[in-house]
Amino acid sequence: KLTIESTPFNVAEGKEVLLLAHNLPQNRIGYSWYKGERVDGNSLIVGYVIGTQQATPGPAYSGRETIYPNASLLIQNVTQNDTGFYTLQVIKSDLVNEEATGQFHVYPELPKPSISSNNSNPVEDKDAVAFTCEPEVQNTTYLWWVNGQSLPVSPRLQLSNGNMTLTLLSVKRNDAGSYECEIQNPASANRSDPVTLNVLYGPDVPTISPIISPPDSSYLSGANLNLSCHSASNPSPQYSWRINGIPQQHTQVLFIAKITPNNNGTYACFVSNLATGRNNSIVKSITVSASGTSPGLSAGAHHHHHH
């Protein structure tokens, strides 16, 4: 039985489509292609005589159609008006003609989408972020990608407005990364340039790492004290030190050479992040013994945080 196959079935505007004829009869002498579901002289696109290999355009010919000896019809630079049915009539030597109808659907060429955001530098646990994929295109599917992966399942992620809008509720530091949106129809897809979400967070409660030179398990008089403070923060926190409440340097590491019992006291590391408006600190008590029996760092470190 004569059949028509459209390749592809869903065509993007401006592309081309090939209507392929299958199971052509042996005694064929010519073909005629018509726009629509029936044979109608006003809808004739093109006729073809096999013996002379002559193609004759009809009233529905647009100049974009090409007929081939195997009865296939190529339509180039398709428009949405080309959507619909196409009928092939095969003229046989016994004058008992055969007909078959095929169809294809033309979808608009999709624009490259872009992402707008209400806040590309949100503060953790404080701000929500809404990404909007633009423009709005009818009969189009909207998809979102985070760091090249499909959206994770999370109660803090909400899709709305036909998936055009992605909202991150109470943003977390792990939400940072590259966001893309993609628009799809059955014929094509187009993806936006990535937008980077920079989540501001911290500073977390700092930690102090005691490094003693030479390495030892206790603080002996004459040793070098090397206190390193660290706090997770974006942007990096500003560090500062206080010894017994007296401001010291603004470095991450506090170094004191050849400590003595005069260096006993409370050592506080302060961290601040102007972008989040948050501060934190940790206090450690240090005891230095003049003899070989040193208690070292106090076991109980205090930490304070302020918002």
Epitope: N121, P235, S236, P237, Q238, Y239, S240, Q249, H250, T251, Q252, V253, F255, L274, A275
Partner: antibody, heavy 120, light 107 residues
Framework: QVQLVQSGAEVKKPGASVKVSCKAS????????LHWVRQAPGQGLEWIGY????????SYAQKFQGRVTMTRDTSTSTVYMELSSLRSEDTAVYYC?????????????WGQGTLVTVSS | DIQMTQSPSSLSASVGDRVTITCRAS??????LAWYQQKPGKVPKLLIY???NLVEGVPSRFSGSGSGTDFTLTISSLQPEDVATYYC?????????FGQGTKVEIK
């Protein structure tokens, strides 16, 4: 007290290289990052880049990428800034400056400056 | 890169006048902004950091304010020794960028 002492003035031909030194004293050299800033005659301040003397890590302004190299010698508490492929518009006073603290701080102590003149 | 725009480029005021210099950043700086003073033939001197923190030894007639992208340096009562060029600079990560400078003169 904190001091940053730079090497003396240099006159160079276009296409040549210049290496300026900055010797630090009065503080723990490896604890503070050192930046280089230049100032063309009658002009404003332009940041070139910085080096972390502890690790040797460097970061340069895009404009100077490929032409500038910053190094350090912890044994002498000295940092160096070498600028290659000199052109006349590189004529400027080059300053080394210490960052006030670690991470997101400005520059609190500055060297006296080194005048580099590029002329044929 | 972040652009820093200062205004005015120069000003002339009388001793005792209140002087204001503004600095605008092309992006939010979250308060990471510093001011420097450079007297003729001298090296730059840090006056203020974190928008409003006065460096030890800097006279209290200098003050800073602002947030986001707009910042101000104020000299409450201009003194002859304040004749200099003043630069703003953001210090939220590198590359650091400076304003083009404001030259302050005495009438």
């Amino acid at each position: 007290q904190v001091q940053l002492v730079q090497s003396g003035a240099e006159v160079k031909k276009p296409g040549a290289s210049v290496k300026v030194s900055c010797k630090a004293s009065g503080y723990i050299f490896t604890s503070y990052w050192l930046h280089w800033v230049r100032q063309a005659p009658g002009q404003g301040l332009e940041w070139i880049g910085y080096i972390n003397p502890n690790t040797g890590y460097t970061s340069y302004a895009q404009k100077f990428q490929g032409r500038v190299t910053m190094t350090r010698d912890t044994s002498t508490s000295t940092v160096y800034m070498e600028l290659s492929s000199l052109r006349s518009e590189d004529t400027a006073v080059y300053y080394c400056a210490r960052e006030y603290g670690n991470y997101n701080y400005p520059l609190d102590y500055w060297g006296q400056g080194t005048l580099v003149t590029v002329s044929s | 890169d972040i652009q820093m725009t200062q205004s005015p480029s120069s000003l002339s005021a009388s001793v005792g006048d209140r002087v204001t210099i503004t600095c605008r950043a092309s992006e939010n700086q979250y308060g990471y902004l510093a001011w420097y003073q450079q007297k003729p033939g001298k090296v730059p001197k840090l006056l203020i950091y974190n928008t409003k923190n006065l460096v030890e030894g800097v006279p209290s007639r200098f003050s800073g304010s602002g947030s986001g992208t707009d910042f101000t340096l104020t000299i409450s009562s201009l003194q002859p020794e304040d004749v200099a060029t003043y630069y703003c600079q953001h210090h939220l990560g590198t590359p650091y960028t400076f304003g083009q400078g404001t030259k302050v003169e005495i009438k």
